[in-house]
């Protein structure tokens, strides 16, 4: 516990002190006091440097003195033989004796008292920045006028902080400018402008004179500008070293002026003003800015329009332009929006065709549609090449956005029929020779596929069964083969209006207009064994001449069988109608004269016994197209005949093309259009 005074005596004092002793005393007086230690008696064995016996006085780490021998006072009015004055409040006294004393030594008597210290003068480091005031047990600092004492109670500074500038224009200077600025001060000035305006600071070089930097380049006094996370400075020296125009990009600016204790100069003066916050003229690819300006500032609005082929995608909605506003923070609104290449998406698939998976579906990409060759071709032209257009659609030069349509190739058998003389007198055939051949099982008859949805046959085939079961794609017509072939389901039967319906069809003598169409429920898929036959053109090129050859096919009666199991075919010449008239009817149901012959009928056959017969009805009489030798068209349909193995009569299809086209158009489905 600190005391104001005390006594220290060597062991056994005033008797002789013993040998081999080491004793220490820790003296402590209250803080703010020094210690006055004085000896009134000193009798200790003398030795060089007091090596044998001694009393040692230590202050902190410093030895203040080491005493031995005998001392007497120099002043007759004072008993003090030795004294020490320390400006600290702690002191240590240590007494040591060695193992022997040649004489009897009595030791020492000492006293200490707490003494006032003058902190203002007693130390190298001055405790106060300005005025120091000593008092017993302490000191206090004070400041000149206009200065105030900082919280550390030692340093004085001017009260230059707390000013907030909100005007759009203003001037700020260091304290006392142009007189020397106060030392040891930190001045903080705040500029706070309306959002959307940036603080722009302007200085003149000559309006700045601040204590220069030290040899390491560190400013001793400094001026710093802080705008958000950006800092300008520190600045110091004679003449402003920074840019004379500082665009802070912020509406808030803190100005910090820090001075030390020495080297005061005239200081600084600056002007500031609020500029509408500029927004950068960004390089937004693939777009145009409207209006175009050299500089955009707070509240400016631009319309950013994408170039052709580019779009702004926001969520699921694509747009060609957007508005952007220069915001108070110097950033554009909608800055995340970009003009991206238009994406036309995965191209739509088409029936009976395909499109290769595109490498890209973006603007400018090219895709190619192809039809499933050789069974389908592109009906509506355009070549099948589409490019991704600016409006986000796949576009063809000819068709625009309309998709190509793959329609069946007509009249081209996968394998040509090689005629072998063996229908009546005909040959075995493969369905690939006659892929248009349709089999009707009730009645046992034939028909011709003319497109995906329509079968052409004879009226007398369907007059008794308006819901015929039909098959395509099979050479043989055993039940098991038909089960594996394609069955066609009728939707509606259209018999030519000129066909006379009879109550007893078996007695028919008039086969004029023996033609009918069957509309199918579902489209037929074409392939090597299923493919339509062409219809005749309406030009005179399609008028048949006597001797013109045509092919007939079917599963009708042969020389050996009532019904063929495997498809049969024969090549027949067209003959004059009179040749058919001249043949005697095999099993007449009326007078020979009752049988009607009209220009709607073709007579053919008579050569090598080749003819169509019962069960072949409705099948096509296929003739090579005069304008395209690779194709066959249905010139006729097996209708009737006087006698198998002679001449047969065929419905002249050319005379019914208008009716066929009209019927199909009026009864087509939307997906077929």
């Amino acid at each position: 516990e600190p005391t104001m005074y005390g006594e220290i005596l060597s062991p056994n004092y005033p008797q002789a002190y013993p040998s081999e002793v080491e004793k220490s005393w820790d003296i402590e007086v209250p803080e703010g006091y020094g210690i006055h230690l004085y000896f009134t008696h000193l009798d200790i064995e003398l030795s060089e440097n007091c090596a044998y016996d001694s009393v040692q006085i230590i202050s902190g780490d410093t030895e203040e003195g080491r005493l031995c021998g005998q001392r007497s006072s120099n002043n007759p009015h004072s008993p003090i033989v030795e004294e020490f004055q320390v400006p600290y409040n702690k002191l240590q006294v240590i007494f040591k004796s060695d193992f022997s004393n040649e004489e009897r030594f009595t030791g020492f008597a000492a006293y200490y008292v707490a003494t006032d210290i003058n902190e203002c003068t007693d130390f190298v480091d001055v405790p106060c920045s300005h005025f120091c005031n000593n008092f017993i047990g302490g000191y206090f600092c004070s400041c000149p006028p206009e200065y105030f004492l900082h919280d550390d109670m030692k340093n004085c500074g001017v009260n230059c902080s707390g000013d907030v500038f909100t005007a759009l224009i203003g001037e700020i200077a260091s304290p006392n400018y142009p007189k020397p600025y106060p030392e040891n001060s930190r001045c903080e000035y705040q500029i706070r402008l309306e959002k959307g305006f940036q603080v722009v600071v302007t200085l003149r070089r000559e309006d700045f004179d601040v204590e220069a930097a030290d040899s390491a380049g560190n400013c001793l006094d400094s001026l710093v500008f802080v705008a958000g996370d950006r800092q300008f400075g520190p600045y110091c020296g004679h003449g402003f070293p920074g840019p004379l125009n500082i665009e802070t990009k912020s509406n808030a600016l803190d100005i910090i002026f820090q001075t030390d204790l020495t080297g005061q100069k005239k200081g600084w003066k600056l002007r500031y003003h609020g500029d509408p916050m500029p927004c950068p003229k960004e390089d937004t690819p693939n777009s145009v800015w409207e209006p175009a300006k050299a500089k955009y500032v707070f509240r400016d609005v631009v319309q950013i329009t994408c170039l052709d082929g580019f779009e702004v995608v926001e969520g699921r909605v694509g747009a060609t332009s957007f508005y952007s506003t220069c915001q108070s923070n110097g950033k554009w609104s909608n800055s995340k929006l970009k003009c991206q290449p238009v994406d036309c998406g995965i191209p739509e698939s088409i029936e009976n065709g395909k499109v290769e998976d595109p490498e890209s579906t973006l603007f400018g990409s090219v895709i190619r549609y192809t039809c499933e060759e050789p069974y389908y071709y592109m009906e509506n032209g355009g070549g099948g090449e589409y490019h991704c257009a600016g409006n986000g659609s796949w576009v063809n030069e000819v068709l625009g956005p309309e998709l190509p349509k793959c329609v069946p190739v007509c009249g081209v058998p996968r394998e040509p029929f090689e005629e072998k003389q063996r229908i009546i007198g005909g040959s075995d055939a493969d369905i690939k020779n006659f892929p248009w051949q349709v089999f009707f099982d009730n009645p046992w008859a034939g028909g011709a596929l003319i497109n995906e949805y329509w079968v052409l046959t004879a009226a007398h085939v369907v007059e008794g069964n308006r819901e015929p079961t039909m098959y395509v794609g099979s050479t043989s017509v055993q039940t098991s083969r038909l089960a594996k072939s394609k069955m066609l389901t009728p939707e509606h039967v259209f018999i030519h209006p000129g066909w006379k319906l009879l109550e007893v069809p078996e007695g028919r003598t008039n086969f004029d207009n023996d033609i009918a169409l069957v509309r199918l429920k579902d489209p037929v898929k074409m392939g090597p064994t299923v493919s339509p036959i062409c219809l005749p053109g309406t030009s005179s090129d399609y008028n048949l001449m006597d001797g013109d050859l045509g092919l007939i096919s079917g599963w009708g009666r042969t020389e050996k069988r009532d019904r063929a199991v495997r498809l049969k075919a024969a090549r027949l010449p067209v003959a004059p109608l009179r040749k058919c008239k001249e043949v005697k009817v095999e099993k007449p149901t009326a007078d020979a004269e009752a049988y009607v012959f009209t220009p709607n009928m073709i007579c053919a056959g008579g050569e090598k016994g080749m003819d169509s017969c019962k069960g072949d009805s409705g099948g096509a009489f296929a003739v090579q197209d005069p304008n395209d030798k690779t194709k066959f068209y249905a010139a006729g349909l097996v209708s009737w005949g006087p006698q198998c193995g002679t001449y047969g009569l065929y419905t002249r299809v050319k005379n019914y093309v208008d009716w066929i086209m009209k019927t199909m158009q009026e009864n087509s489905t939307p997906r077929e259009d």
Epitope: E415, K420, D428, D430, R561, R566
Partner: antibody, heavy 118, light 107 residues
């Protein structure tokens, strides 16, 4: 007159191959569907394979599918049967037959014997 | 596959006898059936096609009948040259199949 002559038969080890030929004459070969039919010693007839006039359509018995291949060369009036991966159960007299019309075999060859044995 | 069951597998009859062979299909084959005759060491010969049609040049003592699954082959008056094995053959579906054969002998 119509003649069908088979050749190419003989002794072969199991797993081996043989190619049978059938030379046709006396009729228009390309006019007819053709078949191979076999008869194991002392057993009944077994249909093996069938080919259309042009050669584009072919059918096989389950027992030979994937191992035997039927083909024809209309220019040479010849029918062929390539037999691979032969097994002991393929031992038989192999006939080529003309399908007169609708699966009725009206003309047959004299047959060629194929023996599969190790 | 369509199985063709022929019976009897063999028979012995006298010259002039009426001989009947039956063939049963494992499923309906309509009239898609032929009958063949094979003499020892010879190739088969077509006798009847489409179940009941007599092939050109075949003696009229041979006949066939039936439809669906049950078929009959008849020799109205057995002759010595008729000694042979007779096979039925269906062509309704692939694979084409033959009956096991009926061996006809003279008593």
């Amino acid at each position: 007159q119509v003649q069908l002559v088979e050749s190419g038969g003989g002794l072969v080890k199991p797993g081996g191959s043989l190619r049978l030929s059938c030379a046709a004459s006396g009729f228009t070969f390309s006019d007819y569907y053709m078949s191979w039919i076999r008869q194991a010693p002392g057993k009944g007839l077994e249909w093996v394979s069938y080919i259309s006039r042009s050669g584009s359509t072919k059918y096989y018995a389950h027992s030979v599918k994937g191992r035997f291949t039927i083909s024809r060369d209309n220019a040479k009036n010849s029918l062929y049967l390539q037999m691979n991966s032969l097994r002991a159960e393929d031992t038989a007299v192999y006939y080529c037959a003309r399908d007169e019309t609708d699966y009725a075999y009206d003309e047959w060859g004299q047959g060629t014997l194929v023996t599969v044995s190790s | 596959d369509i199985q063709m069951t022929q019976s009897p597998s063999s028979l012995s009859a006298s010259v002039g006898d009426r001989v009947t062979i039956t063939c049963q299909a494992s499923q309906d084959i309509s009239n898609y059936l032929n009958w063949y005759q094979q003499k020892p060491g010879k190739a088969p010969k077509l006798l009847i096609y489409d179940a009941s049609n007599l092939e050109t040049g075949v003696p009229s003592r041979f006949s066939g009948s039936g439809s669906g699954t049950d078929f009959t082959f008849t020799i109205s008056s057995l002759q010595p040259e008729d000694i042979a094995t007779y096979y039925c053959h269906q062509y309704e579906d692939y694979p084409l199949t033959f009956g096991g054969g009926t061996k006809v002998e003279i008593k």
